[in-house]
């Protein structure tokens, strides 16, 4: 049994890091393998992660972490029974994938303005709380070409757009994702999408 693709890990910079790897053949990850991880710190203890299958030869493990600070470094040991298959390390702050924003809501009762709001996925005491920026994706269910991205580079988790920038009388969907420039993170997954019917009063033409 050998590792074909070494584990690569990403952290949500809060409580979970996810590691994925590939074996050289079909493997029952949960019965044959264990991923041991330990924070390089005086008070820490080793923890064991039981991997799950992720495709035939692929495995994935969700490492639970109490808390994350930028200096943290973890040792990783992948075992098959008594055999050490791979040894490595992982610095969560260098491989951050933020959590997806939640509670995306479209408020359509503000005159002819659409107000989209969502929740920051981090608690206020987490470093990323004040460092997230967002991308909002709005698209038409009827017209695949009607697809747009709004970059929200301020901290407030909201976006205002004129209803008239979208077509009237049709349904739209929106979703939002996050990233943090400070840690050069990847983008988060998209939030679940929300749907609304766009309608607004056409302004009277002046002749």
């Amino acid at each position: 049994m050998k590792v074909l693709q070494e584990p690569t890990c990403v952290s949500d910079y809060m409580s979970i890091s996810t590691c994925e790897w590939k074996m050289n053949g079909p493997t029952n990850c949960s019965t044959e393998l264990r991923l041991l991880y330990q924070l390089v710190f005086l008070l820490s203890e080793a923890h064991t992660c039981i991997p799950e299958n992720n495709g035939g030869a692929g495995c994935v493990c969700h490492l639970l972490m109490d808390d994350v600070v930028s200096a943290d470094n973890y040792t990783l040991d992948l075992w098959a029974g008594q055999q050490l298959l791979w040894k490595g390390s992982f610095k969560p702050s260098e491989h951050v994938k933020p959590r997806a924003p939640g509670n995306l809501t479209v408020h359509t009762n503000v005159s002819d303005t659409l107000l989209l709001t969502w929740s920051n996925p981090y608690p206020p005491d987490n470093y990323l709380y004040n460092h997230l920026t967002y991308a909002v994706n709005i698209w038409s269910e009827n017209d695949p070409a009607d697809f747009r991205i709004y970059n929200v580079t301020y901290l407030e988790p909201s976006l205002r757009i004129a209803a008239s920038t979208l077509k009237s009388g049709i349904s739209y969907r929106a979703r939002v994702r996050a990233w943090a420039q400070c840690y050069n993170t990847t983008w988060s997954e998209w939030s679940p999408s929300t749907k609304w019917h766009n309608s607004y009063r056409e302004p009277f033409e002046q002749h």
């Epitope: 710190f41 005086l42 008070l43 600070v69």
Partner: antibody
Framework: DVQLQQSGPELLKPGASVKIPCQAS????????MDWVKQSHGKNLEWIGN????????FYNQKFKGKATLTVDKSSSTAYMELRSLTSEDTAVYYC?????????????WGQGTSVTVSS | QIVLSQSPAILSASPGEKVTMTCRAS?????IHWYQQKPGSSPKPWIY???NLASGVPVRFSGSGSGTSYSLTISRVEAEDAATYYC?????????FGGGTKLEIK
Amino acid sequence: DVQLQQSGPELLKPGASVKIPCQASGYTFTDYNMDWVKQSHGKNLEWIGNINPNNGGTFYNQKFKGKATLTVDKSSSTAYMELRSLTSEDTAVYYCGRGGLRRRGFLDYWGQGTSVTVSS
Amino acid sequence: QIVLSQSPAILSASPGEKVTMTCRASSSVIYIHWYQQKPGSSPKPWIYAVSNLASGVPVRFSGSGSGTSYSLTISRVEAEDAATYYCQQWSVNPPTFGGGTKLEIK
């Protein structure tokens, strides 16, 4: 509100022992370690050791092994440090502090300190 | 054990000035914490794990560094910042403290 309450000053003779209490309130006592720190001459700080109130596990600075013994009473949320065979070198202010893994050993709350004076 | 050397021992600054104090370790460490202490009081939690401000610490304070060299910076000193600042390492047993930098305000 998190509070760590320590006892008042102690004046002791060489060779004596003293047991300093640190009563915790405002948080779940077993969720954090209790660390102890010595401050001599109002300046030098030395880490003595810590105890995990959940399982009673202790972690000492080698220098204080045999000098300090750390214990807890979970029922009263109180940590204790006993110092034995006291000498003038033990004259100092002793602090308890809430620590642990979560903030990488950082003591985020401190007691007000207990002054121990050893004199014949 | 790891020896932490803080410099300068005494730092004198005028209100509004930017000041930096350093903490050098005798060998490489990962986690450095900082505490503030005023005469007659317990040390106060100030900065943890190199750069994270403890609750209630003004944002004019910041921490940085890696390896053997760490620093605490105050962007604009205020009179209330007069105190002694201690660094502490939590990477090698036993955890050790520096000798402190006393900040005086002119």
